[in-house]
Each structure stands twice: as structure tokens, then as C-alpha cells.
């Protein structure tokens, strides 16, 4: 059985205020069963950015159809970027558990920073 890897190919993503940012994340295995969530930051202070299962995240759309059985692409787009959105974003795999899912593995993170507007 192949060990799950969380791949976030970009270490740094330069974005423009007001535009849409695409954060890439793919997994190498469908196991263990459980959701992939997106966070900004690490530790107890991290911000939940996207959870497919619950909540309403109006600025976030997924690149792929997460409901497809064999989907391994958990990339997201965040629209209407502001300076308050800068930080490092992590896709995190959770293992299905009872009563709560358990964090299993995190991607290496993608730092989102503001780039100069194109002239």
C-alpha cells in the first residue's frame, strides 16, 4: 500500500490584491479514508480556510469535483484577495474517526504573498 503524500508544488505564490489565487494540492493515495481541509498557518491559531463537509466558504471554489470517487486533486481558488489573506496555506488530510476525524498528514505549505501589480 502506497504511503500518502500531500503535494503542494509551489513554495511561494505571488498574488495581486483583488484577483483570484489558486492553491494547488494533490494526494498520492486515496487512503486513509477522510476529508482534506485547508488551513492558513499552523498550530492552534490556524485559520480554517475550506472544509468540503461543513460550513460555507463563499470566496473558495475547488478546482476539481471533490465528490468524484477517485478524486486526488484538492486544489482551491480564493477570490478577491486582500492584504489580510497573506500567509502560508496548508492542505491537511484527516483520517475518518469517531466521534471526530483525526489529523493524519499535512502538505508542506504554500506561502501566499502580495506581488506588485503588473504595469
Amino acid at each position: 500500500e502506497e504511503e500518502l503524500q500531500m503535494i503542494q508544488p509551489e513554495k511561494l505564490l505571488l498574488v495581486t490584491v483583488g484577483k483570484t489565487a489558486t492553491l494547488h494540492c494533490t494526494v498520492t493515495s486515496l487512503l486513509p479514508v477522510g476529508p482534506v481541509l485547508w488551513f492558513r498557518g499552523v498550530g492552534p491559531g490556524r485559520e480554517l480556510i475550506y472544509n468540503q463537509k461543513e460550513g460555507h466558504f463563499p470566496r473558495v471554489t475547488t478546482v476539481s469535483d471533490l465528490t468524484k470517487r477517485n478524486n486526488m486533486d484538492f486544489s482551491i481558488r480564493i477570490s478577491s484577495i486582500t492584504p489580510a489573506d497573506v500567509g502560508t496555506y496548508y492542505c491537511v488530510k484527516f483520517r475518518k474517526g469517531s466521534p471526530e476525524n483525526v489529523e493524519f498528514k499535512s502538505g508542506p505549505g504554500t506561502e501566499m504573498a502580495l506581488g506588485a501589480k503588473p504595469s
Epitope: 490556524r46 485559520e47 466558504f57
Partner: antibody
Framework: VQLVESGGGVVRPGESLRLSCAAS????????MNWVRQAPGEGLEWVSR????????DYAESVKGRFTISRDNSENTLYLQMNSLRAEDTAVYYC????????????WGLGALVTVSS | ETVLTQSPATLSVSPGERATLSCRAS??????LAWHQQKPGQAPRLLIY???RRATGIPDRFSGSGSGTDFTLTISSLQTEDSAVYYC??????????FGGGTKVEIK
């Protein structure tokens, strides 16, 4: 969406009070929450914010070191522990749900009146 | 720190007339500006977000416009129930979240 504050009352300067905000009608654990206050006859003043998981907090300078925001996601409840209260803390305190992690306040509670007076 | 200045402080408008409220930011806030309505003795209620998007259930007589530093809330045909204080809020830079000082709309 419903937000109901409780715990307000009359206290003397230097005393403490804890406000609660019971949330229902939405996935509480997915959203950042805030406290906003309004002194009598005045405008709105943001007090504090807590992130969805409860580990990240921010405070207005006027309350830093005296107030502590917290949440219990299993009970769908937001708290504001207010210590060393001053007369200028007298206000209606509203809890407010945040639209997303970096956003405006889309739902407000009815408010709890806190009066600090000797 | 971004300061929001609302004008006028008080606006008296006859029923059926147009009310125009202004909110000016001390530095750009992009389109990240919301408007809240607060009726006497009640909690605030979200009207407009992202400068021009109406919140759920808000009548279409309320509209928002502007970007950068200058924003406008327009009530196209004032109703008696629109008597309230209106606050703008920016969420481009935070913390802290900032509100304007408010505009009180009175019915003539």
C-alpha cells in the same frame, strides 16, 4: 442563524463578568466569531475576534490584557471573560458571526448590557 | 490603521425620496466594505457587503457603490421603516476591524 447573548449585568469597577453567546442554525465550528460593543448613544466598537478552532485571538487595544475571548465548539458557545472592568466598558455587547475567515459580520446577536458603576 | 469617516452625521429625508450616505476610508480598502443598519433598540443588521452586494433578504431599494476610498449607500425610495443609523465597516486590513461613526437617517 441565531445568536443569543447572556451574562450581562451591573458590576463595580475592578470586578469581573463573563458573557456567553449561544449559537444555532449554522456550523459554528467553521466560523470565526467576534464581540462588538456599543456604549450608550455611541457607535460600534470591535472588541475581539476568535478563529474557528479557538486557538487564534485578536483584541482591541482598549481591552487587551483585561478581556479574554474563548469558545466551546462542542457546545456552540462563544464567551467573553471581562476582568478589571472600568466605567468606560459600559456598553451593549454583541456577538457577531464572521462571513468567512477574512470578512465582515453577517449575523449579530441581540446584545447583552454591561453596566460598570460604583 | 484605516479610519472610516461617514457623512453626513444626520440626514433628514421625506418618504419616497432618495437618501445618499457616504463613507470615506483614510486608505484604500479595495471593495472590502460593508454597510450595517441599526434601528433604535435593535441589533445591527447586514445590508451590503463587498461594497455593492446586497445581503440575503435586503430590499432592492438599498444599493451600494464605490471602491478604493470612497463609498456610497443609496436608499432609492425611503420608507418609514428605514429610519435607523447606518454604519460602514472595512475588512481589508485587520485587526482591528473598523466601523465608521454612523449616519442617522431621519424621516421628515
Amino acid at each position: 442563524v441565531q445568536l443569543v447573548e447572556s451574562g450581562g449585568g451591573v458590576v463595580r469597577p475592578g470586578e469581573s463578568l463573563r458573557l456567553s453567546c449561544a449559537a444555532s442554525g449554522f456550523s459554528f465550528s467553521s466560523y470565526a466569531m467576534n464581540w462588538v460593543r456599543q456604549a450608550p448613544g455611541e457607535g460600534l466598537e470591535w472588541v475581539s475576534r476568535i478563529n474557528s478552532g479557538g486557538g487564534g485571538t485578536d483584541y482591541a487595544e482598549s481591552v487587551k490584557g483585561r478581556f479574554t475571548i474563548s469558545r466551546d465548539n462542542s457546545e456552540n458557545t462563544l464567551y467573553l471573560q471581562m476582568n478589571s472592568l472600568r466605567a468606560e466598558d459600559t456598553a451593549v455587547y454583541y456577538c457577531a458571526k464572521q462571513y468567512d475567515w477574512n470578512g465582515f459580520f453577517d449575523y449579530w446577536g441581540l446584545g447583552a448590557l454591561v453596566t460598570v458603576s460604583s | 490603521e484605516t479610519v472610516l469617516t461617514q457623512s453626513p452625521a444626520t440626514l433628514s429625508v421625506s418618504p419616497g425620496e432618495r437618501a445618499t450616505l457616504s463613507c470615506r476610508a483614510s486608505q484604500t480598502v479595495g471593495s472590502k466594505l460593508a454597510w450595517h443598519q441599526q434601528k433604535p433598540g435593535q441589533a445591527p443588521r447586514l445590508l451590503i457587503y463587498d461594497a455593492s452586494r446586497r445581503a440575503t433578504g435586503i430590499p432592492d431599494r438599498f444599493s451600494g457603490s464605490g471602491s478604493g476610498t470612497d463609498f456610497t449607500l443609496t436608499i432609492s425610495s425611503l420608507q418609514t421603516e428605514d429610519s435607523a443609523v447606518y454604519y460602514c465597516q472595512q475588512y481589508y486590513y485587520w485587526p482591528p476591524y473598523r466601523f465608521g461613526g454612523g449616519t442617522k437617517v431621519e424621516i421628515k
